[in-house]
């Protein structure tokens, strides 16, 4: 999906009002300095591409974040403010539902969500020069 036609300010507002709180809840009990940010993005469409990938694509050590509250709200916010986004989404959560029987928060998942927080922070500050 090409995120260039999204309403970035609305997505930013949705993040600040609700998604960020769910990310903080997920990370509760973890020190903010515990993980180094290794994933970066260069502009808002790129940030959303990386956020989508990290939120919805299974990775080694963290099978699925898609059923977490922050992920469900991210999916909704992207669909609400990116015309045509929902039409591009295959029914991936059904497969994930079958695959994962119980919620296990692994250290790898915490690290991944820490990376997500960094990507969202970068998304919210688009005019900052890339380090």
């Amino acid at each position: 999906y090409d995120f260039t036609n999204c309403d970035f300010e609305k997505i930013k507002a949705a993040y600040l009002s609700t998604i960020s709180k769910d990310l903080i809840t997920y990370m509760s009990g973890t020190k903010s300095t515990e993980f180094n940010n290794t994933v970066s993005c260069s502009n808002r469409p790129h940030c959303l591409t990386e956020i989508q990938s990290l939120t919805f694509n299974p990775t080694a050590g963290c099978a699925s974040l898609a059923k977490e509250m922050f992920a469900m709200k991210t999916k909704a916010a992207l669909a609400i403010w990116c015309p045509g986004y929902s039409e591009t989404q295959i029914n991936a959560t059904q497969a994930m539902k079958k695959r994962r029987k119980r919620k296990v928060t692994t250290n790898k998942c915490l690290e991944q969500v820490s990376q997500l927080q960094g990507l969202w922070r970068r998304f919210n500050r688009p005019l900052l020069k890339q380090q």
Epitope: A14, A77, I80
Partner: nanobody, 115 residues
Framework: QLQLVESGGGLVQPGGSLRLSCAAS????????MGWYRQAPGKERELVAA??????YADSVKGRFTISRDNAKKNTLYLQMDSLKPEDTAIYYC??????????WGQGTQVTVSA
């Protein structure tokens, strides 16, 4: 303050259709995002469909439910529900907000799908 009032709920047979409406009054300048949630007995409230410049549908209703709104006045939201199933039985709530539909809530309307 914004008020949201739902209507259109009722009893319908499996495979049938219903159209829910939600009328917004008051401070409607703050309702760029609007949506429908549902809550079945003993279950968490879930976002079923939402609309802004794009649309969102929960996987369980994709292809069966259609969300729309009165684009001229932006003060009426609709949910066309087709091919209804018993598992669609729930209280349906209209909600809205500036960027995500979770700031203002209606009182809900009961939808029951049963033979």
């Amino acid at each position: 303050q914004l008020q949201l009032v739902e209507s259109g709920g009722g009893l319908v047979q499996p495979g049938g259709s219903l159209r829910l409406s939600c009328a917004a009054s008051g401070s409607i300048f703050s309702i760029d995002a609007m949506g429908w949630y549902r809550q079945a007995p003993g279950k968490e409230r879930e976002l079923v469909a939402a609309i802004g410049s794009g649309t969102y549908y929960a996987d369980s209703v994709k292809g069966r439910f259609t969300i729309s709104r009165d684009n001229a006045k932006k003060n009426t939201l609709y949910l066309q529900m087709d091919s209804l199933k018993p598992e669609d039985t729930a209280i349906y709530y209209c909600a809205s907000g500036d960027s995500y539909p979770d700031e203002y809530w209606g009182q809900g309307t009961q939808v029951t799908v049963s033979a």
